[in-house]
Structure formats: structure tokens, C-alpha cells
């Protein structure tokens, strides 16, 4: 995209004048831009996972589905668990909105959250004893 020049009247985030509170519309644009049918990777992966429901009504979004690895090891070609490899979660840091209080349902704070979106198979870290 083309870099647009900043309006000189706009304060920088480092500025003491930068607003601590902003008004945000919760009507999301392009919500379905990546709309796709749910894949079955969670079953076909060599490090399969299950999806667990995490609901928190004080958060926006309230419901987040998180991945939990099914095995410690990975699944080999025969469908058996191989403990020479490890299943580990793939974690993504996301920003959510946290309600400031139950009595102020339209006032939020930004909060960082670490969410597991799937699992992958890795070689284990081997510690050699001296």
C-alpha cells in the first residue's frame, strides 16, 4: 500500500497528549474474509489435537476454542504413538478486550492472551548427562 503522510495534528503514541481511551466500533469489518470449511487437520496431523471451549463473559470475544495436544508423542505411519518425537502446541499471542467491570459492560481494556491454535510434531530436546 501507499504510505500516507500523517496529519501533523495527530499525536504520536509516545506523546503525553496521546489518548488513553478510544472509541471502537465492535462491528467487525471483513469478519468472514478467510471463511473456510473447518479442516480436519486436528485428526490427520501426526500431532493431533482436540479443541476445548474457553468462555469468559467478561472478555470480547467471549468464546475462544483452544487446541490441546492429544498425545505427548507423535503418531507414526502405523497410527501408533512414537515417544521419540513430541507433540507441542502452536501458540499465538492475540489481543482481546477485557470488560473493566461487571457494572460497566461497555468499557474495556486491551489484554494480551496466549492461545494454542494447533499442535505440531518436533524432535525432543535431549539433555546429555555428563
Amino acid at each position: 500500500g501507499i504510505a500516507m503522510p500523517r496529519n501533523p495534528g495527530c499525536p504520536n503514541a509516545e506523546d503525553k497528549n496521546f489518548p488513553q481511551n478510544v472509541k471502537v466500533s465492535l462491528n467487525i469489518l471483513n469478519k468472514s474474509v478467510n471463511s473456510r470449511r473447518p479442516s480436519d487437520y486436528y485428526n490427520r496431523s501426526t500431532s493431533p489435537w482436540t479443541l476445548h471451549r474457553n468462555e469468559d463473559r467478561e472478555r470480547y470475544p467471549s468464546v475462544i476454542w483452544e487446541a490441546k495436544c492429544r498425545h505427548l508423542g507423535c503418531v507414526n505411519a502405523e497410527g501408533n504413538e512414537d515417544h521419540h518425537m513430541n507433540s507441542v502446541p502452536i501458540q499465538q499471542e492475540i489481543l482481546v478486550l477485557r470488560r473493566e467491570s461487571q457494572h460497566c459492560p461497555h468499557s474495556f481494556r486491551l489484554e494480551k492472551m496466549l492461545v494454542a491454535v494447533g499442535c505440531t510434531c518436533v524432535t525432543p530436546i535431549i539433555h546429555h548427562m555428563a
Epitope: L26, I28, K31, S32, S35, P38, S39, D40, Y42, L51, H52, R53, E55, R57, Y60, P61, S62, V63, I64, W65, P105
Partner: antibody
């Protein structure tokens, strides 16, 4: 206009399975989960489970002991509830209801009209 | 599972009466209560969410209150269309459970 339209009444034999559909319209299907609730004749409401059409995630009431399978087809905005190993006590009206993932204070705001399932030999 | 016990299970009242339905949770580990109204042969309709808040299009004669294990639905002045069965639902502990219902009948 938001609508959840369910499939028609079913009569099933004990031991068989039933699959009820719930077609959604009037909103973005993947922004909402679909929950399933049933009501036996003259009884109260019983939560069965939830399906997230976006991720494919499911969570069930353990009371149903693996007999319930919830799925969704994003291409047709339709959710499905399959109940296997039917017994007479599964005779009930089965409802689908949507549940906002963005703000679950908006949970269960719209319901399907209900599907009557009768299990009888 | 958390059991939700509604009382009374049935209630006779007249148009204009003030009516209170209570819902008690078997433990206090719940976040909120939602209330639903159901008429014969129809799907439930959400009345109150998050214990206190009125759902869209619901008349202001309905109100909700409570905390911990005890919750209340109040109808300040009964109207003919309010005769129905009312259910509470606990949110925050799985599986989410409904009360057994309170049938409100015309006296």
C-alpha cells in the same frame, strides 16, 4: 431476519439413530456457535452440547455418553445433531439455538422451532 | 453438575399481581443466570441475561436480580400474555443446566 429452521418430525425404532438439521440464515454463521437443547414431554430443558461451525470444535454433555455427534456445514449454514442408540427416553423435542462467540451475553437469543423425535417400537 | 432448583414449581396468580420466581444453585460457582419464558408448543424465549439485563424487546415489567446461589425473576404487574413456564439457566459451570421450570397459571 435471523432464522433457525429445523428439519421435520421423526419416528425412530429403539437402537437406531436420528439426524436433525438446523439451517441458519440472516446472520454470519461462523460468528455464532450452535447449541442443542432437548425437552422431553412435560419436562424441563436439557443442554446437550455445542458446535463451533468455524473451528469444528464440539463440547458435549457427558450425560449422553458419546451418543451425540454435532457437526456443521459452513457452505450451507446448516448444523446437525445426530443421536445414536436411541431409547424410549430420548423421545423429546430437540431445539437448536445460536450463541454469539463475540459476546456471549447474546447467548441463546434465537431458537429453532423444534424437531419432535419419537422413539417407539 | 450444578443443580438449579426453581421455586415454586407452579404458581397461580391474577392479572396485575406482582410475581417472584426464585432459582437456587446447588453451589455458588456460577457466573450468571439467564431466564427464559416458554409457551406451550413454542421454543423458549430469552427474557433476562447476565442476571439483570433485559433482552431486546422484553417489557420492563420483567426484572432479574441475585448473586451467589440465589437468583430471582420478578414480574411487577402480570399481563395476560405472561402466563407461561419460566426457566432459569446457570452460566459458568459445565454442563450448563436449566432449572426444572415454574408454571405460571391464571388464578
Amino acid at each position: 431476519e435471523v432464522q433457525l429452521v429445523q428439519s421435520g418430525a421423526e419416528v425412530k425404532k429403539p437402537g437406531s439413530s436420528v439426524k436433525v438439521s438446523c439451517k441458519a440464515s440472516g446472520y454470519t454463521f461462523t460468528d455464532y456457535e450452535i447449541h442443542w437443547v432437548r425437552q422431553a414431554p412435560g419436562q424441563g430443558l436439557e443442554w446437550m452440547g455445542v458446535n463451533d461451525p468455524e473451528s469444528g470444535g464440539t463440547f458435549y454433555n457427558q450425560k449422553f455418553d458419546g451418543r451425540v455427534t454435532l457437526t456443521a456445514d459452513e457452505s450451507t449454514s446448516t448444523a446437525y445433531m445426530e443421536l445414536s442408540s436411541l431409547r424410549s427416553e430420548d423421545t423429546a423435542v430437540y431445539y437448536c439455538t445460536r450463541y454469539s462467540k463475540w459476546d456471549s451475553f447474546d447467548g441463546m437469543d434465537y431458537w429453532g422451532q423444534g424437531t419432535t423425535v419419537t422413539v417407539s417400537s | 453438575d450444578i443443580q438449579m432448583t426453581q421455586s415454586p414449581s407452579s404458581l397461580s396468580a391474577s392479572v396485575g399481581d406482582r410475581v417472584t420466581i426464585t432459582c437456587r444453585a446447588s453451589s455458588g460457582i456460577i457466573s450468571y443466570i439467564d431466564w427464559f419464558q416458554q409457551k406451550p408448543g413454542k421454543a423458549p424465549k430469552r427474557l433476562i441475561y447476565a442476571t439483570f439485563d433485559l433482552a431486546s424487546g422484553v417489557p420492563s415489567r420483567f426484572s432479574g436480580s441475585g448473586s451467589g446461589t440465589d437468583y430471582t425473576l420478578t414480574i411487577s404487574s402480570l399481563q395476560p400474555e405472561d402466563f407461561a413456564t419460566y426457566y432459569c439457566r446457570q452460566v459458568g459451570s459445565y454442563p450448563e443446566t436449566f432449572g426444572q421450570g415454574t408454571k405460571l397459571e391464571i388464578k
